[in-house]
């Protein structure tokens, strides 16, 4: 009779994480008598996966009934596969011995490969806000995928970005992999509503890539433009001066009126109007009582936006002919207002 052979018909088996792997093994003879054991890996450091004779292997079930006398099918199923289960599995026949069974013959091995989905990409932007025309970096990370082959792309508002650097780790063989990418994005004044998207394509995703997003509203700071204008005289001794604060983002803004360098009033932007591009407009006015001034008045609108150094715009108010004093000591009436969006 021919000597027993251990047949592992599958050179490789590919299983998705969470599924059950079937590792096939048959013997060509019932002789010699002795148990079968399954190992992952070869040599002295091999890991016991299943022992027909003894032990508790909760994730392993046999395909056929190994207690039957004429059984020659030693295939096993391993449940709830994870990337850590990847490796080469050997079906090994032992010959009954005393005191210990002796290894008789091994199958050629079956390589178990595990397909694991990448985690949802996480996109993070810079810690501090930046202004238009500046270049900022975004990072994208995704973990736990297998096999290693993966494709990552960056988009801004649906347009592909080309300035990025991507690494997949580790470089060598591993049960699972991570991807890390850094993209450079040049900000524009219109980017308040913009999105940066990191997209990852992998065999496990079946043509439906995973996306991670970052809103540039959390990254951009659009500094305001200021315009100070003198309105027509409201009463014979009062002049209305307005400060238009336009196209700023975020909303956090404090405005201070100065008369000849002295603080007249400070207010915080509250009722702002929003432009189509996501930036804000705001207007403040100051009623100046010209009868309280003997000389020309320098009015300054000073704006501190989002904790940045103040910017200001001045207007020289000509006090040419004084009307008769009307007993008012007040140089300015403290009035604030918001404008309607005219854009």
């Amino acid at each position: 009779e021919e000597e027993l052979q251990v047949i592992q018909p599958d050179k490789s088996v590919l299983v998705a994480a969470g599924e059950t792997a079937t590792l096939r093994c048959t013997a060509t003879s019932l002789i010699p008598v002795g148990p079968i054991q399954w190992f992952r890996g070869a040599g002295p450091g091999r890991e016991l996966i299943y022992n027909q004779k003894e032990g508790h292997f909760p994730r392993v079930t046999t395909v056929s009934d190994l207690t039957k006398r004429n059984n020659m099918d030693f295939s096993i199923r391993i449940g709830n596969i994870t990337p850590a289960d990847a490796g080469t599995y050997y079906c090994v026949k032992f010959r009954k011995g005393s005191p210990d069974d002796v290894e008789f013959k091994s199958g050629a091995g079956t390589e178990l490969s595990v397909r694991a989905k990448p985690s949802a990409p996480v996109v993070s932007g810079p810690a501090a806000r930046a202004t238009p025309q500046h270049t900022v970096s975004f990072t994208c990370e995704s973990h736990g995928f297998s096999p290693r082959d993966i494709t990552l792309k960056w988009f801004k508002n649906g347009n592909e970005l080309s300035d990025f650097q991507t690494n997949v780790d580790p470089v060598g063989e591993s049960v699972s992999y991570s991807i890390h990418s850094t993209a450079k994005v040049v900000l524009t004044r219109e980017d308040v509503h913009s999105q940066v998207i990191c997209e990852v394509a992998h065999v496990t995703l079946q043509g439906d890539p995973l996306r991670g997003t970052a809103n540039l509203s959390e990254t951009i700071r659009v500094p305001p433009t200021l315009e100070v204008t003198q309105q027509p005289v409201r009463a014979e001794n009062q002049v209305n001066v307005t400060c238009q604060v336009r196209k700023f983002y975020p909303q956090r803004l404090q405005l201070t009126w100065l008369e000849n360098g002295n603080v007249s009033r400070t207010e915080t932007a509250s009722t702002v109007t929003e432009n189509k591009d996501g930036t804000y407009n705001w207007m403040s006015w100051l009623l100046v009582n010209v009868s309280a001034h003997r000389d020309d008045v320098k009015l300054t609108c000073q704006v501190e936006h989002d904790g940045q150094p103040a910017v200001s715009k001045s207007h020289d108010l000509k006090v040419s002919a004084h009307p008769k004093e009307q007993g008012s000591n007040t140089a300015a009436e403290n009035t604030g207002s918001n404008e309607r969006n005219i854009y």
Partner: antibody, heavy 121, light 107 residues
């Protein structure tokens, strides 16, 4: 500069074999899945085969399955197509092309200039 | 395998005019579709992927639309360099397959 240069084309008899090569430069070759696409004289494009960046995964068109083998040597930055049992209908210009990453997705964005294979007795 | 059908086979349009090319898949390919341009004697060039995303360096006059089985490539104002062959390709299912092509010629 990103470049891909095919070679190995020529005249071969039906039933014969040829091995095409595609030498890549200017990019990290192992980070990109690669493909072979062919175009018969006066005809359209036909996708032939693809291989992932690591080389662990390969795919073939039904018309070449069992006859053609795609492989890559990442240490040499070279893609190969071993063509056996060649037929007259395999006559075409063969292009190598690179995908956007090591998994074949998003289309092929870098192409070589092609090498001509003629199968005739 | 998924069969990709392009229409028309030949399209005659005057420079400056709009060109609309169609591509139909025999079963859904989601949005996993690319468009390529090929000029005579040259290698193909990727124009659009993901059905509607322009590849790097492709002019804004090229736009793609559609999902599932019906796709369109539109060239808004034809330039002389746009007269060429155009191919759609699905990358949703193996084997990846091309359409038979549309030849865009000067009217």
């Amino acid at each position: 500069e990103v470049q891909m240069l095919e070679s190995g084309g020529g005249l071969v008899q039906p039933g014969g074999s040829l091995r095409l090569s595609c030498a890549a430069s200017g990019f990290t070759f192992s980070s990109y899945a690669m493909s072979w696409v062919r175009q018969a004289p006066g005809k359209g494009l036909e996708w032939v085969s693809a291989i992932s960046g690591s080389g662990s995964s390969t795919h073939y068109a039904d018309s070449v399955k069992g006859r053609f083998t795609i492989s890559r040597d990442n240490s040499k930055n070279t893609l190969y197509l071993q063509m056996n049992s060649l037929r007259a209908e395999d006559t075409a210009v063969y292009y190598c092309a690179a995908y956007s990453g090591s998994y074949y997705y998003y289309g092929m964005d870098v192409w070589g200039q092609g090498t001509t294979v003629t199968v005739s007795s | 395998e998924i069969v990709m059908t392009q229409s028309p086979a030949t399209l005659s349009v005057s420079p400056g005019e709009r060109a609309t090319l169609s591509c139909r898949a025999s079963q859904s390919v989601s949005r996993n579709l690319a468009w390529y341009q090929q000029k005579s004697g040259q290698a193909p060039r990727l124009l659009i992927y993901g059905a509607s995303t322009r590849a790097t360096g492709i002019p804004a006059r090229f736009s793609g639309s559609g999902s599932g089985t019906e796709f369109t490539l539109t060239i808004s104002s034809l330039q002389s360099e746009d007269f060429a062959g155009y191919y759609c390709q699905q990358y949703n299912n193996w084997p990846y397959t091309f359409g038979q092509g549309t030849k865009l010629e000067i009217k």
